[in-house]
């Protein structure tokens, strides 16, 4: 899969889980760097991935809510991320400065199912995202919505 960032260091990866969705995220940020990431798979938190330290932000996804797009910012290390969800919400972690890239699936309808990358003592050197179809398909047609949402926090 595609990796963002300069790379280098030890590899990390979330547990491959074919039975649960990502239901929450913890991201630790310190000294202007993203230190570590941790995903909740179903009801259980997976192992923390990355470097030690930092202050931890935790977000919980609603039932049927998925991460569909991620912006990442690098300056030697991962500086920040914005995660967009299928319910028009977004979560900021760290600061979006430096080299900004967007990550999204090549297949319509796929969602975030895993995170991998490389880390060193100070933080995350590269990050990649695994996308796949959700385990539960939508049961109804999305509502016809002819209203327009406010501008996104990140430019197109």
């Amino acid at each position: 899969g595609k990796m963002y960032g300069p790379g280098g260091g030890k590899y990390f990866s979330t547990t491959e889980d074919y039975d649960h969705e990502i239901t929450g995220l913890r991201v630790s940020v310190g000294l202007l760097l993203v230190k570590s990431v941790q995903v909740k798979l179903g009801d259980s938190w997976d192992v923390k991935l990355g470097a030690l330290g930092g202050n931890t932000q935790e977000v919980t996804l609603q039932p049927g809510e998925y991460i569909t797009k991620v912006f990442v910012a690098f300056q030697a290390f991962l500086r920040g991320m914005v995660m967009y969800t299928s319910k028009d919400r977004y979560f900021y972690f760290g600061k979006l400065d430096g080299q900004i890239s967007s990550a999204y699936p090549s297949q319509e309808g796929q969602v975030l199912v895993g995170i991998y990358g490389q880390y060193q003592l100070l933080g995350i050197k590269s990050i990649g995202f695994e996308w796949n179809y959700p385990l539960e398909e939508p049961t109804t047609e999305p509502p016809v919505n002819l209203t327009y949402s406010a501008n996104s926090p990140v430019g197109r």
Epitope: E108, Y133, V144, Y148
Partner: antibody, heavy 119, light 112 residues
Framework: QVQLKESGAELVRPGALVKLSCKAS????????MHWVKQRPEQGLEWIGW????????IYDPKFQGKASLTADTSSNTAYLQLSSLTSEDTAVYYC????????????WGQGTLVTVSA | DIVMTQSPSSLAVSAGEKVTLSCKSS????????????LAWYQQKPGQSPKLLIY???TRESGVPDRFTGSGSGTDFTLTISSVQAEDLAVYYC????????FGGGTKLEIK
């Protein structure tokens, strides 16, 4: 109900470019990816790519990278396909398409636009 | 790239006959996470846009007559029309949605 209305037939010169439109009604294109498919005369279907009109993200089949450019205007609920450096190989019917309530499958199709490249 | 190969390229049958169309993919379309095959069948009648018939290899789209049945898994798939009607004259395409989207070359069904 869901409708995709494509622009009229085009006769264009080799080397020129053409921009086709697909006007959606019955839904907001912001909520769906818009796909484009090529069909050469008496031949099969080829997927060109998709655009996410809300964010402007695009993905192309590698063989159409550099040939096709997808854009969308959410204010007019319209998706566009631009084809550049046209040759006789680009003579085809071009369809826009949209999924139904499930992703991965194209449940709604436009009527198609015939592009003829000829000197 | 996933390559989709359909056979035969054309066939002619009489109304009421059973017909079987084949589609093979160059790699498995079975998603190990969702345990579903990302294969669809489309019907394109002369002068018309394609129409979705079957998805997930075997699920019939609503409104599609039950004489159309999809089967198969992995790399080998089949569309069966149990009793061909005159209105089934069309080209039938399979399409994978496992990695990007690729159509097969199509099978042209003619009625004798």
């Amino acid at each position: 109900q869901v409708q995709l209305k494509e622009s009229g037939a085009e006769l264009v010169r080799p080397g020129a470019l053409v921009k086709l439109s697909c006007k959606a009604s019955g839904f907001n294109i912001k909520d769906y990816y818009m796909h484009w498919v090529k069909q050469r005369p008496e031949q099969g279907l080829e997927w060109i790519g998709w655009i996410d009109p809300e964010h402007g993200n695009t993905i192309y089949d590698p063989k159409f990278q550099g040939k096709a450019s997808l854009t969308a205007d959410t204010s007019s609920n319209t998706a566009y396909l631009q084809l550049s450096s046209l040759t006789s190989e680009d003579t085809a019917v071009y369809y826009c398409a949209r999924r139904g309530w499930l992703p991965a499958w194209f449940a709604y199709w436009g009527q198609g636009t015939l592009v003829t490249v000829s000197a | 790239d996933i390559v989709m190969t359909q056979s035969p390229s054309s066939l002619a049958v009489s109304a009421g006959e059973k017909v079987t169309l084949s589609c093979k993919s160059s790699q498995s379309l079975l998603n190990s996470r969702t345990r579903k095959n990302y294969l669809a069948w489309y019907q394109q009648k002369p002068g018309q846009s394609p129409k979705l018939l079957i998805y997930w290899a075997s699920t019939r789209e609503s409104g599609v007559p039950d004489r159309f049945t999809g089967s198969g898994s992995g790399t080998d798939f089949t569309l069966t029309i149990s009793s061909v009607q005159a209105e089934d004259l069309a080209v039938y395409y399979c399409k994978q949605s496992y990695n990007l989207y690729t159509f097969g070359g199509g099978t042209k069904l003619e009625i004798k």
